[in-house]
């Protein structure tokens, strides 16, 4: 007998043919012997099987001697053997119905566990292979589990049922919901405004939930939150913000968050965290902010940084267009009786500049103009 | 060539039946379904039903099922739709018709039925 | 009951016109549809069936498309004798209900 696979939902077409190119009578029944279609004629006629309203034929293919029977909105119950009555001969099919579902939602967090479940009929054995967007393979029987969901999981997941040497596929589209980037660092000189910006690795058509950023300066001894706010269908509305600093938000989507000035007193480090309506859990977002200050004071010129500095960056006093004079994988250093002319702070990684401040000192007689 | 040839003109009383005949020629009788359609003065056509005269099995359109027979007398070729319990609203000419491979192919001329009182 | 809306319910047309009819079910019939065409006093003529078979005989210049719920009844070049009824027909699901019909008139 004939195996045909389907998809839970889909649409099905199990074929019968006569030897005669034309219409002459025929009728599918199930196993139960229950009539589910035929033709009175030239006429279609429906059977009291569950199927009646989702069984469909097709007119034009009668002529040529095809009399199909289309099964709309599969579902797994569905699976049975189907016999067509045609020119005094029985053609049997076995429909065999599969379902892949993702546990509860197809959006999940970043770090969360991914669980597809296989819906087959009684007596089948199935086997599942499903292939990830970044081409990693998982096998199993009834239920797949993927745990520690990572960004590139994002996309669709190819998921192939194999029953009797017949394959059916399956498509999930599997959204991991996170922050584009897990860390970033703002490299800022002292005074200068500060943007932060929190991009989505996702959209979704609404989107709400609360938000919050905790600060961690270098200088405090606790962390402290800084600003509280909603999200409703893509709009922020800030809740509570502190008064030092003053931060302003976007009203839109990406996050984005604007410290006037940047000062040594906030740099340091904090984390966004983003509560999804519906969702357990909360996606997160690190953030550092590095400050840097050139001072001259009598003779001694200082460079200093403050904040989340690796230990391989190299902060260097120069004069410009000139060799460092100072170059050291230390936050502070200072050059004692400078010369005259513009000087340049740099905070470099492997000899890429990070940050730069700019200095003029004066002949000793007059005071020192910071540009 | 095939031919359907219906019964002559009726007038029936409210209440009454009437017995419209369709003689079938010039093809196998048993292979063909043949369906009954009627059409109002000024109207439509109306699907009634059909008979398989083979198996002398029926189906009727609802709306007539217990006031409608269809039967068959497969010696002379000849079908019969018989509709009882009339009302003026039954005034309308009745059409037998044929069907094929195809579709309602052949029809007979029509049997005007007018319910008067 | 399956319902068939045709439209128009009439229409004028000259010799030479290209007329289009539409007929539309309540819910899918697949390709399960009839045309006829009918002269006054007359029985009606089978013109097309599976929505879009020509049926023997009947001239070229009919043709019938559509699947689902809408169908469409073209007569490319109207002639003469095409002046007359159009009526669908869902041969779907018992009661095998007609449309109300087109009336074909001389402009």
């Known amino acids: 007998k004939k195996v045909v696979l389907g998809k839970k939902g889909d649409t099905v077409e199990l074929t019968c043919t006569a030897s005669q190119k034309k219409s002459i009578q025929f009728h599918w029944k199930n196993s139960n012997q229950i009539k589910i279609l035929g033709n009175q004629g030239s006429f279609l006629t429906k059977g009291p099987s569950k199927l009646n309203d989702r069984a469909d034929s097709r007119r034009s293919l009668w002529d040529q001697g095809n009399f199909p029977l289309i099964i709309k909105n599969l579902k797994i119950e569905d699976s049975d053997t189907y016999i067509c009555e045609v020119e005094d001969q029985k053609e049997e099919v076995q429909l065999l119905v599969f379902g892949l579902t993702a546990n509860s939602d197809t959006h999940l967090l970043q770090g969360q566990s991914l669980t597809l479940t296989l819906e087959s009929p009684p007596g089948s054995s199935p086997s599942v292979q499903c292939r990830s967007p970044r081409g990693k393979n998982i096998q199993g029987g009834k239920t797949l589990s993927v745990s520690q969901l990572e960004l590139q999981d994002s996309g669709t997941w190819t998921c192939t049922v194999l029953q009797n040497q017949k394959k059916v596929e399956f498509k999930i589209d599997i959204v991991v919901l996170a922050f584009q980037k897990a860390s970033s660092i703002v490299y800022k000189k002292e005074g200068e405004q500060v943007e932060f910006s929190f991009p989505l690795a996702f959209t979704v058509e609404k989107l709400t939930g609360s938000g919050e950023l905790w600060w961690q300066a270098e200088r405090a001894s606790s962390s402290k939150s800084w600003i509280t706010f909603d999200l409703k269908n893509k709009e922020v509305s800030v809740k509570r913000v502190t008064q030092d600093p003053k931060l302003q938000m976007g009203k839109k989507l990406p996050l984005h968050l604007t410290l006037p000035q940047a000062l040594p007193q906030y740099a340091g480090s904090g984390n966004l965290t983003l509560a999804l309506e519906a969702k357990t859990g909360k996606l997160h977002q690190e953030v550092n902010l590095v400050v840097m200050r050139a001072t001259q004071l009598q003779k001694n010129l200082t460079c200093e940084v403050w904040g989340p500095t690796s230990p391989k960056l190299m902060l260097s006093l120069k004069l410009e267009n000139k060799e460092a004079k100072v170059s050291k994988r230390e936050k502070a250093v200072w050059v004692l009786n400078p010369e005259a002319g513009m000087w340049q702070c740099l905070l470099s990684d492997s000899g890429q500049v990070l940050l730069e401040s700019n200095i003029k000192v004066l002949p000793t007689w007059s005071t020192p103009v910071q540009p | 060539q095939v031919q359907l040839v219906q019964s002559g003109a009726e007038v029936k009383k409210p209440g009454a039946s009437v017995k419209v005949s369709c003689k079938a020629s010039g093809y196998t009788f048993s292979d063909h379904h043949v369906h009954w359609v009627r059409q109002a003065p000024g109207q439509g056509l109306e699907w009634m039903g059909w008979m398989n005269p083979d198996s002398g099995n029926t189906g009727y359109a609802q709306r007539f099922q217990g006031r409608v027979t269809m039967t068959r007398d497969t010696s002379t070729s000849t079908v019969y739709m018989e509709l009882s319990s009339l009302r003026s609203e039954d005034t309308a000419v009745y059409y037998c018709?044929?069907?094929?491979?195809?579709?309602?192919?052949?029809w007979g001329q029509g049997t005007l039925v007018t319910v008067s009182s | 009951d399956i319902q068939m809306t045709q439209s128009p319910s009439s229409l004028s047309a000259s010799v030479g016109d290209r007329v289009t009819i539409t007929c539309r079910a309540s819910q899918s019939i697949s390709d399960f549809l009839n045309w006829y065409q009918q002269k006054p006093g007359k029985a009606p003529k089978l013109l097309i069936y599976a929505a879009s078979t020509l049926q023997s005989g009947v001239p070229s210049r009919f043709s019938g498309s559509g699947s689902g719920t809408d169908f469409t009844l073209t007569i490319s070049s109207l002639q003469p004798e095409d002046f007359a009824t159009y009526y669908c027909q869902q041969s779907y699901s018992s009661p095998y209900t007609f449309g109300q019909g087109t009336k074909v008139e001389i402009k």
């Open positions: 018709a044929r069907d094929s491979t195809s579709g309602v192919d052949y």
